[in-house]
Amino acid sequence: GIAIPRNSGCPNSEDKNFPRTVMVNLNIHNRNTSTNPKRSSDYYNRSTSPWNLHRNEDPERYPSVIWEAKCRHLGCVKADGNVDYHMNSVPIQQEILVLRREPRHCPNSFRLEKILVSVGCTCVTPIVHHVA
Amino acid sequence: GIAIPRNSGCPNSEDKNFPRTVMVNLNIHNRNTSTNPKRSSDYYNRSTSPWNLHRNEDPERYPSVIWEAKCRHLGCVKADGNVDYHMNSVPIQQEILVLRREPRHCPNSFRLEKILVSVGCTCVTPIVHHVA
């Protein structure tokens, strides 16, 4: 954690392991008002490394639904719609934070958890050409 | 939130707005032990839609450092290394959860926030608008 001077207006923490356990307000503030995330929603179909989105649901996790990308092909798609064997479709992965109910089924107690999700796919050259 | 029967072993919540504010254990559990996220770290350079990673730092946020992808080209890179302007490099975006210190500078009080981040880039066929 980052050492930040305590503000006198901060809520009190009675947790002896402070700041291991913190209070989190679940009223989500969405900073994406100026951006429309749906604008990228058709990329999965138009990409040269297209992907399908699979729903991953877990009621013990917040958010309970996460969408996982799975590349449709091992190779990339050429302009004519056929596979290019010389290029590979690969998933772009990102570590994200989720909240895991702990103890299980508790509505007001969570643990922070890092999970790796595939967000989409990109087309890469399989061989790195090393210059002598 | 999801209505889940309260488990008798759950921590008590004295917050009158329960379950708007919850307790979160910041000892992160990492579920990615079987996967090595670094293995995809060179895709940004080998992709036909390569990207650069920019560091976005905010001490009032957890995690404080987030890496943002910016596509290097408007078009996609061909096998010969030249840019194909008939195709478009576009960012793959994902909404992620972060914790925002609230009130500001408080070490143990946060609000959940959704932000949109660009994770990498993919090469897509442009939408051609046909004039009637």
Epitope: L74, G75, V83, D84, H86, V90, P126 | R39
Partner: antibody, heavy 120, light 107 residues
């Protein structure tokens, strides 16, 4: 039941030609990638050709490029390998193999193989 | 081309033994690895794809592991029908290439 049956192998002189066929049954042939893989006597496996589900993409390793041609007739559920300018080192059992996907990357079903012998 | 080096080239083992076969690629193949079993006079039979995914119908005593350049096929308890030659194959970079094979013989 998935079945792949190769035919067309035999003895041919160096410089000669041969056309192998692979008759497929028990699955929707037109939706699967197919390949030819060969195995020289007492040796390991070597990729010879790949073709995707509709014949729009093919690949050949340098060892056969310009001499061999893979094709398919989805209406006849048949895969072909046209082999020209045959050399002694092309002597092998030739297998046709199916990819569980559209394209031809790895192989979940194989034929019994047909022996091609190139010798004078 | 990516070179696939299998080891050992042959091994002798008894029924019930745990057997491990390794395959090393000349560069990272990003888990795009298949394992096959071949018996004399027969075509190869797919056991594993994607380095770890067991094909349907393949006994659970077979398992694949590894990442990057190094991969392993393990037979947890060797059965009489497992005496055969095993091949790995990479499908990351064309041309797809196979290892030289590992012959598993009865001790």
């Amino acid at each position: 039941e998935v079945q792949l049956v190769e035919s067309g192998g035999g003895l041919v002189q160096p410089g000669g030609s041969l056309r192998l066929s692979c008759a497929a049954s028990g699955f929707t042939f037109s939706t699967y990638g197919m390949s030819w893989v060969r195995q020289a006597p007492g040796k390991g496996l070597e990729l010879v050709a790949i073709i995707n589900h509709n014949g729009g993409s093919t690949f050949y390793p340098d060892s056969v490029k310009g001499r061999f041609t893979v094709s398919r007739d989805n209406s006849k559920n048949t895969l072909y390998l046209q082999m020209n300018s045959l050399r002694a080192e092309d002597t092998a059992v030739y297998y046709c193999a199916r990819d569980p996907r559209h394209d031809g990357y790895f192989f979940d079903y194989w034929g019994q193989g047909t022996l091609v012998t190139v010798s004078s | 081309d990516i070179q696939m080096t299998q080891s050992p080239s042959s091994l002798s083992a008894s029924v019930g033994d745990r057997v491990t076969i390794t395959c090393r690629a000349s560069e990272d193949i990003y888990d795009r690895l298949a394992w096959y079993q071949q018996k004399p006079g027969k075509a190869p039979n797919l056991l594993v794809s994607g380095a770890t995914s067991l094909e349907s119908g393949v006994p659970s005593r077979f398992s694949g592991s590894g990442s990057g350049k190094d991969y392993t096929l393990t037979i947890s308890s060797l059965q009489p029908e497992d005496f055969a030659t095993y091949y790995c194959q990479q499908y990351w970079s064309v041309p797809w290439t196979f290892g030289g094979g590992t012959k598993v013989e009865i001790k």
